[in-house]
Interface confidence: low
């Protein structure tokens, strides 16, 4: 399937609009600090070049790889060294090393200003004045802040973003129409970014085999009526799509994702009965819908797994003959029978099964050795079940904010070296598992909770990797992808930690807190809570609760005062003194 000109091939497959959008995303994800106008200029130059190649595939440079073309274009940026420092050294390398170099410099936490939402009228004016620029700016701002965002899915978000403005800027109450839609897109976008970041981490840190195992388990749960060979084909294709997107090959990724959606819809009879509605939608909606589709019903009367994977005398022969295929079948058969298990649990079970076969197939009596392998699964299944039960009970008792606070304290004591903003962000997200998953019936709780926690803990891992400060975090993040959550759960208070020096400035607040949104105010309080624990890691729950209650009362009192700033200054000193006394600082 070779093409004389790869850039012409992708331009024709994707169409000009998607081509330009994807090139913009790719460039913004690589050069995250470059101004919008510079990126637009680069994209226009690439697009004009692509058009010449469409007209004549034999034209000069049209035979070059996309990495070569895009890399050459990025390396024309004049301020590369001043803005990006050592990333400029990438430009001295040849492909494929140059692209690998760019990938390594992607920054999960770029030093960019927070996106402030303008007034609705201002946004609507900007949208009507130049719709194309307005939407490009959205792609640019999201892509540069989320350098691993799944590019074809970002096109879907942009389509919804456009639809929201098209509808709401004509509405009688623009704000009432638009703001909830923008909030929803923001929250869904953050979740989508985090989910994709885990896929890329899985591929980049643990390899294709780890990603394929994840995909076999997830697709087998989702499509339990599909044949193993069908699931295997989907896994192979899906792995290619995500490898491309995680590797910065966004045009190929979007093109292959469209092909995969087409294949799934053409073959839905042998895949799942739940795809009909998805397959009637336009391309971007269709792909999104397939990715989120509910699990199909399990086939009736599935035979016991034990016959093929334990009782059979040929287990070792089958395993030796094609290890990964045999383990893939085990994972497929187990996952399709267990939509109630998290993917990471299924992968732990498969790993246990693999380890047992490795040991037993070399033993004198293999069958005797592996006969009880399924008994080893019981504690692995019960551990997440019990953890979820306990935490959902705590969530129901405390509510989301206080549940987040409990997790903040728990995780700050486990890994106090981690930066306060990271601990706040991660613990807040961990705490959201309650409202997201605890409402579900038992059968849906574990896949919801544990797989969500995998996504959140990956955020901790990628943020920590940028500036490693804790050996414990490094250990949990790198040893095993599927055991990250149990590894963090098992961490106790870090007894080696030397408490942080007390700094009154950390606990000094001003009247500006009164004008913050409820969410921002919570973050301020939670930041203070983390700092308290870092100063006094042995503080009891009761002590911390008392200080936090005093703090909440102090904020409420001063925000009602006539002279707010004076109140914050005077009452703040008293609060700090009282807190120090209460905690014995």
């Amino acid at each position: 399937d070779a093409h004389k000109s790869e850039v012409a091939h992708r331009f024709k497959d994707l169409g000009e609009e998607n081509f330009k959008a994807l090139v913009l995303i790719a460039f913004a994800q690589y050069l995250q600090q470059c101004p919008f106008e510079d990126h637009v200029k680069l994209v226009n130059e690439v697009t004009e070049f692509a058009k010449t190649c469409v007209a004549d595939e034999s034209a000069e440079n049209c035979d070059k790889s996309l990495h070569t073309l895009f890399g050459d274009k990025l390396c024309t940026v004049a301020t590369l060294r001043e803005t990006y420092g050592e990333m400029a050294d990438c430009c001295a390398k040849q492909e494929p090393e140059r692209n690998e170099c760019f990938l390594q410099h992607k920054d999960d936490n770029p030093n960019l200003p927070r996106l402030v939402r303008p007034e609705v009228d201002v946004m609507c004016t900007a949208f009507h004045d130049n719709e194309e620029t307005f939407l490009k700016k959205y792609l640019y701002e999201i892509a540069r802040r989320h350098p691993y965002f799944y590019a074809p899915e970002l096109l879907f978000f942009a389509k919804r973003y456009k639809a929201a403005f098209t509808e709401c800027c004509q509405a009688a109450d623009k704000a009432a129409c638009l703001l909830p839609k923008l909030d929803e897109l923001r929250d869904e976008g953050k979740a989508s970014s985090a989910k994709q970041r885990l896929k890329c981490a899985s591929l980049q840190k643990f390899g294709e085999r780890a990603f394929k195992a994840w995909a076999v388990a997830r697709l087998s749960q989702r499509f339990p009526k599909a044949e193993f060979a069908e699931v295997s084909k989907l896994v192979t294709d899906l792995t290619k799509v995500h490898t491309e997107c995680c590797h910065g090959d966004l045009l190929e990724c979007a093109d292959d994702r469209a092909d995969l959606a087409k294949y799934i819809c053409e073959n839905q009879d042998s895949i799942s009965s739940k795809l009909k509605e998805c397959c009637e939608k336009p391309l971007l909606e269709k792909s999104h819908c397939i990715a989120e589709v509910e699990n199909d019903e399990m086939p009736a009367d599935l035979p016991s797994l034990a016959a093929d994977f334990v009782e059979s005398k040929d287990v070792c022969k089958n395993y030796a003959e094609a290890k990964d295929v045999f383990l893939g079948m085990f994972l497929y058969e187990y996952a399709r029978r267990h939509p109630d298990y998290s993917v990471v649990l299924l992968l732990r079970l498969a790993k246990t099964y693999e380890t047992t076969l490795e040991k037993c197939c070399a033993a004198a009596d293999p069958h005797e050795c592996y006969a009880k392998v399924f008994d080893e699964f019981k504690p692995l299944v019960e551990e997440p079940q019990n953890l979820i039960k306990q935490n959902c009970e705590l969530f129901e008792q405390l509510g989301e904010y206080k549940f987040q606070n409990a997790l903040l304290v728990r995780y700050t004591k486990k890994v106090p070296q981690v930066s306060t903003p990271t601990l706040v962000e991660v613990s807040r997200n961990l705490g959201k598992v309650g409202s997201k998953c605890c409402k579900h019936p038992e059968a849906k709780r574990m896949p919801c909770a544990e797989d969500y926690l995998s996504v959140v803990l990956n955020q901790l891992c990628v943020l920590h990797e940028k500036t490693p400060v804790s050996d414990r975090v490094t250990k949990c993040c790198t040893e095993s992808l599927v055991n990250r959550r149990p590894c963090f759960s098992a961490l106790e208070v870090d007894e080696t930690y030397v408490p942080k020096e007390f700094n009154a400035e950390t606990f000094t607040f001003h009247a500006d807190i009164c004008t913050l949104s409820e969410k921002e105010r919570q973050i301020k309080k939670q930041t203070a809570l983390v700092e308290l624990v870092k100063h006094k890691p042995k503080a009891t729950k009761e002590q911390l609760k008392a200080v936090m209650d005093d703090f909440a009362a102090f904020v409420e009192k001063c925000c009602k005062a006539d002279d707010k700033e004076t109140c914050f200054a005077e009452e703040g000193k008293k609060l700090v003194a009282a807190s120090q006394a209460a905690l014995g600082l």
């Epitope: 009526k225 044949e227 193993f228 060979a229 069908e230 295997s232 084909k233 086939p299 599935l302 035979p303 093929d308 059979s312 040929d314 022969k317 089958n318 003959e321 094609a322 295929v325 079948m329 058969e333």
Partner: nanobody, 115 residues
Framework: EVQLVESGGGLVQSGGSLRLSCAAS????????MSWVRQAPGKGPEWVSA????????RYAESVKGRFTISRDNAKKTLYLQMNSLKPEDTAVYYC????????GSQGTQVTVSS
């Protein structure tokens, strides 16, 4: 598209023979072990026989041992089941499946053995 199409079934007298074929397409046939499974009216699926990806290693259910022979031709992407000394209790829909699954992925071919 992954497809498995069985043929060769039919009506045969007790003690007679039939040769079933399964033509595979849409996946790397030579990389997978294959099985024959049958389902008698009103009963659950029963595993009959399996062959490894290369064709060297074969396995049979006790009920068919010595009478049935499984084989494959990877070049033709086809799986076979030679059935001799057929008995009325062999009457069922026979279908081929990938690996050791006893899940129907195809339509199957009807084998009826009359006494």
């Amino acid at each position: 598209e992954v497809q498995l199409v069985e043929s060769g079934g039919g009506l045969v007298q007790s003690g007679g023979s039939l040769r079933l074929s399964c033509a595979a397409s849409g996946f790397t046939f030579g990389s997978f072990g294959m099985s024959w499974v049958r389902q008698a009216p009103g009963k659950g699926p029963e595993w009959v026989s399996a062959v490894d990806s290369g064709g060297a290693d074969t396995r049979y259910a006790e009920s068919v041992k010595g009478r049935f022979t499984i084989s494959r031709d990877n070049a033709k992407k086809t799986l076979y089941l030679q059935m001799n000394s057929l008995k009325p209790e062999d009457t069922a829909v026979y279908y081929c499946t990938i690996g050791q699954s006893t899940t129907r992925g195809s339509q199957g071919t009807q084998v009826t053995v009359s006494s």
